[in-house]
């Protein structure tokens, strides 16, 4: 017997759908990278899980209390009517910590988006044409950022006049995909929690 597949209904916390798509897209891209870059260190055993957001955002610290505290009073009752233009937070009474958590997620996505777009521009110049970033993954990052919509200034794509170092770009791609997948898992957990609460 086939089990019914849960499809998100329009009234559902909108970011959950985006975060699930993100996790799926990153996982698919990582699998593709592992297969394509077989002669590069691209398995989780071979590389360090380095986080480009380290010391720049505080997603884990900001989002962990949300899961640990089912009781809103544990957040020092610091409730604010935090309204953004984005669909994820619109018209929701949002705790200070939740706002902090979601804005930190937004900053993470922004940083990874810049890195991935810069890398893709380099990979498109590779004569071997070995691997490119999945446009679907880039689109899903964009969709989730739009849903969060924290109106922060746009970060210009890093442009470089240097000749691209394709060897370095491919190793870096593997490391960042692994790190981003871990972050996507965290984001999905947060969104699942917010949807349930």
């Amino acid at each position: 017997r086939n089990l019914p597949v849960a499809t998100p209904d329009p009234g559902m916390f909108p970011c959950l759908h985006h975060s699930q798509n993100l996790l799926r897209a990153v996982s698919n891209m990582l699998q593709k990278a592992r297969q394509t870059l077989e002669f590069y260190p691209c398995t989780s055993e071979e590389i360090d899980h380095e986080d480009i957001t380290k010391d720049k955002t505080s997603t884990v610290e900001a989002c962990l209390p949300l899961e640990l505290t089912k009781n809103e009073s544990c957040l020092n009752s610091r409730e604010t009517s935090f309204i953004t233009n984005g669909s994820c937070l619109a018209s929701r009474k949002t705790s200070f910590m939740m706002a902090l958590c979601l804005s930190s997620i937004y900053e993470d996505l922004k940083m990874y988006q810049v890195e991935f777009k810069t890398m893709n521009a380099k990979l498109l110049m590779d004569p071997k044409r070995q691997i490119f970033l999945d446009q679907n993954m880039l689109a899903v990052i964009d969709e989730l950022m739009q849903a969060l919509n924290f109106n922060s200034e746009t970060v210009p794509q890093k442009s470089s006049l240097e000749e691209p170092d394709f060897y370095k770009t491919k190793i870096k791609l593997c490391i960042l995909l692994h790190a981003f997948r871990i972050r996507a898992v965290t984001i999905d957990r947060v969104m699942s929690y917010l949807n349930a609460s």
């Epitope: 260190p41 071979e46 590389i47 360090d48 380095e50 870096k172 490391i175």
Partner: nanobody
Framework: EVQLVESGGGFAQPGGSLRLSCAAS????????MAWYRQAPGKERELVTS???????NYADSVKGRFTISRENAKSTVYLQMDSLKPEDTGVYYC????????WGQGTQVTVSS
């Protein structure tokens, strides 16, 4: 204050060897993939080899089988053993993180010539 200091460069004949060292601040080194880069005269700086915190290594095709990267985590130091040197290995060698590069050090000059 100085975060990355490379040393060990010098003059070598083709087929010779050199061992480079890079002393890093613990904050730069700890938990990060470290790498050796080189900048040949008139060329862009390029990645030569990298080593993860757990010791996983990778080498550019041009140095595979000749160069060996290693690290001593307790000393926040990364090494590059260069054997069977070729004239095309000439350049300034730098170490840095692979991701989120720190400020570049002065580098150490390697010249391979007969």
């Amino acid at each position: 204050e100085v975060q990355l200091v490379e040393s060990g460069g010098g003059f070598a004949q083709p087929g010779g060897s050199l061992r480079l060292s890079c002393a890093a601040s613990a904050s730069i080194f700890s938990g990060y993939t470290m790498a050796w880069y080189r900048q040949a005269p008139g060329k862009e700086r390029e990645l030569v080899t990298s080593i993860s915190h757990r010791g996983g290594t990778n080498y550019a095709d041009s140095v595979k089988g000749r160069f060996t990267i290693s690290r001593e985590n307790a000393k926040s130091t990364v090494y590059l053993q260069m054997d069977s040197l070729k004239p095309e290995d000439t350049g300034v060698y730098y170490c840095n993180r692979l991701i989120n590069e720190a400020s570049w050090g002065q580098g150490t000059q390697v010249t391979v010539s007969s």
